[in-house]
């Protein structure tokens, strides 16, 4: 009989993985996928990946974009493939920014976007990442 393969988890999605923390992998498996953009020493740093535990991504995904950091999250296989996070335009406020995508389901409402307004650093994203 063939070697026993690891069991699949129906609650996980396949996500595109791009960035230093991905190593040689171009994908990862998690309960949410993300696409992020941050400013690092004046350079735009784009990353894509996944949060393995739903709670890990909860606050990150609810954090509205700031001038130095934007994260967009989604649920669905490869849902972050065509998502590119964008920083808010200077001088414009984004009170109703909806930065959580759930394919074929309604976007999270403006009221849901409240809560702890904690900025997630690039390092935080790496730690949440599946290697």
């Amino acid at each position: 009989m063939e070697d026993e393969k690891p069991k699949v988890n129906p609650k996980l999605y396949m996500c595109v993985c791009e960035g230093l923390s991905c190593g040689n992998e171009d994908h990862c498996e998690g309960q949410q996928c993300f696409s992020s953009l941050s400013i690092n020493d004046g350079f735009h740093v784009y990353q894509k990946g996944c949060f393995q535990v739903y709670e890990q991504g909860k606050m990150t995904c609810k954090t509205p974009p700031s001038p130095g950091q934007a994260v967009e999250c989604c649920q669905g296989d490869w849902c972050n493939r065509n998502i590119t996070a964008q920083l808010p335009t200077k001088g414009k406020s984004f009170p109703g920014t909806q930065n959580f995508h759930l394919e074929e389901q309604k976007l999270i409402s403006e009221e849901d976007l409240g809560g702890e307004q904690k900025l997630i650093s690039e390092e935080d994203l790496h730690h949440h990442h599946h290697h």
């Epitope: 393969k5 699949v8 129906p10 994908h27 309960q31 490869w78 394919e103 389901q105």
Partner: antibody, heavy 119, light 113 residues
Framework: EVQLVESGGGLVQPGRSLRLSCAAS????????MHWVRQAPGKGLEWVSV????????DYADSVKGRFTISRDNAKNSLFLQMNSLRPEDTALYYC????????????WGQGTLVTVSS | DIVMTQSPDSLAVSLGERATINCKSS????????????LAWYQQKPGQPPKLLIY???TRESGVPDRFSGSGSGTDFTLTISSLQAEDVAVYYC?????????FGGGTKVEIK
Amino acid sequence: EVQLVESGGGLVQPGRSLRLSCAASGFTFDDYGMHWVRQAPGKGLEWVSVISWNSATIDYADSVKGRFTISRDNAKNSLFLQMNSLRPEDTALYYCAKKNSLGWFFDYWGQGTLVTVSS
Amino acid sequence: DIVMTQSPDSLAVSLGERATINCKSSQSVLYSSNDNNYLAWYQQKPGQPPKLLIYWASTRESGVPDRFSGSGSGTDFTLTISSLQAEDVAVYYCQQYYSTPLTFGGGTKVEIK
């Protein structure tokens, strides 16, 4: 248009083997996990097996574990089910089904291929 | 394994009347982290493969008439056909996708009275 076409079914004696195929078209095959689901004549649906998009993870129903092997060829947009040590209770219509991107439910099914195990 | 139990086994309803099918899981299929119920409903007409009607317990698949609706949470779920049409004669199945092995209910046959 998404299409799934099963083939390879037929009449086989108990203990013998059969290999089912499923030809997929109309979607990006290597993006999706694929499943086999069977239905005995006049009975309900029974999940048989799943294979992830890259074949890295596989799972089987206890009733077929150790006898059936699922595989796929992404270059040929094809899914397979190798069935060994067949039993009369394996007699069923075998469907290949595509998982939805949002969860492990099935948005597209083939028409099925009938496997009859009898002496 | 999660056992899915459907009731009734068969149901005869007059055209234009409401049909209600129940599905009970042996353990909860509600994932508290994301508040999703991992339950789907299918329709199977004679000689055809199953067709997806509802997922996440209450989300209608695109193209499915709005007379079909799903409700429930945790372990108890319902598929309702608000006004039965002749083309709704079929067997209906629930399926949990909370964990493997994926399991289906035994099916409910809906006929015209």
